[in-house]
């Protein structure tokens, strides 16, 4: 179990989660293995069991606090180790020192809705959750939309520089369905990622009025 | 680009001491995990020991433990490995290395380091 090639991420979803994942090829899936959270600056001390979630690749969340409490700041060192169960003993496999803000990744936007749609265009809005106030404005999203006959793979990205909550989309086809989703991430952190794509939502163009286009 | 530069190298009598120093430049040193490593002549790569970012986990070689500390000062983005109760069996060119994150992984103590100094010779003998 300890010869294959390992790998141990996490990430700070910048208010009270630490999500990991820890692969190794070769592991045995029924491996008892835990993440232990060590704060430099904090009371507490935090484990999370790892959980198989395809053949060689275990998730945990370590839960800090209620989901909108800001339980890490910048100044936060964690040291995070992975142990796996080795006989009567625990044995460290991986080992971090753990800077929550520069190890972002957010949780995916919520709350799409339409707030308007005509037969060429669409606005849409959403909100972020779970997502810091140390950031004020200093986020960027990446929107999508699904039209007739593509693949997510193949819709182009759209870059919102800035904290815009809302899109315009343009150039639509009239009477037409069409699905969107859309990700945030901070601009802060080295190792800071997209958060998980949202729910996409599903929405229709209204069909052109007869004898005109509007 | 990625520096890494070592100094404090020299000849030691058998159980003298002796401190080296890694400079780095080029990169964020306190958001990655750092490594000394050595080859002794006619010998391949033999790690020695492992440091995360913020020093608060270390790992040594069974070789040298008890007798060489690894530390690192992240103001002066410098990586040392004091070495004591020196043996001529340590005699090697040593060279500091950056690994590619913030993780190293202590079963496999070599893997994942992505760059490395030229190094600096330790010499110990009568």
């Known amino acids: 179990a300890v010869n294959g090639t390992s790998q141990f991420t996490c990430f700070y979803n910048s208010r009270a989660n630490i999500s990991c994942v820890w692969s190794q090829d070769g592991a045995l899936q029924d491996t008892s293995c835990q993440v232990h959270a060590w704060p430099d600056r904090r009371r507490w001390n935090q484990t999370c069991e790892l959980l198989p979630v395809s053949q060689a690749s275990w998730a945990c969340n370590l839960i800090l606090g209620a989901p909108d409490s800001q339980k890490l700041t910048t100044v936060d060192i964690v040291t995070l180790r992975v142990l796996c169960r080795e006989g009567v003993r625990w044995r460290v496999m991986a080992i971090q020192d753990f800077k929550p803000f520069e190890n972002l990744r957010l949780m995916a936007p919520i709350s799409l809705q339409v707030v308007h749609v005509e037969t060429h265009r669409c606005n849409i809005s959403w909100e972020i959750s779970q997502a810091s106030h140390y950031f004020e404005r200093h986020l960027e999203f990446e929107a999508r939309t699904l039209s007739p006959g593509h693949t997510w793979e193949e819709a182009p990205l759209l870059t919102l520089k800035q904290k815009q909550e809302w899109i315009c989309l343009e150039t639509l086809t009239p009477d037409t369905q069409y699905e969107f989703q859309v990700r945030v991430k901070p601009l802060q952190g080295e190792f800071t990622t997209w958060s998980p794509w949202s729910q996409p939502l599903a929405f229709r163009t209204k069909p052109a009025a007869l004898g005109k286009d509007t | 680009q990625v520096q890494l530069v070592e100094s404090g190298g020299g000849s030691v009598q058998p159980g003298g001491s002796l401190r080296l120093s890694c400079a780095a430049s080029?990169?964020?040193?306190?958001?990655?995990?750092m490594s000394w490593v050595r080859q002794a002549p006619g010998k391949g790569l033999e790690w020695v020991a492992s440091?995360?970012?913020?020093?608060?986990?270390?790992d040594y070689a069974d070789s040298v433990k008890g007798r060489f500390t690894i530390s690192r000062d992240n103001a002066e983005d410098t990586l040392y490995l004091q070495m004591n109760s020196l043996k001529p069996e340590d005699t090697a060119v040593y060279y500091c290395?950056?690994?590619?994150?913030?993780?190293?992984?202590?079963?496999?103590?070599?893997?994942?380091?992505?760059?490395r100094g030229q190094g600096t010779q330790v010499t110990v003998s009568s």
């Open positions: 290395a950056k690994y590619s994150s913030s993780t190293y992984y202590p079963p496999t103590p070599a893997r994942g380091r992505d760059y």
């Open positions: 080029g990169f964020t040193f306190s958001n990655y995990a």
């Open positions: 440091i995360t970012g913020f020093g608060r986990g270390t």
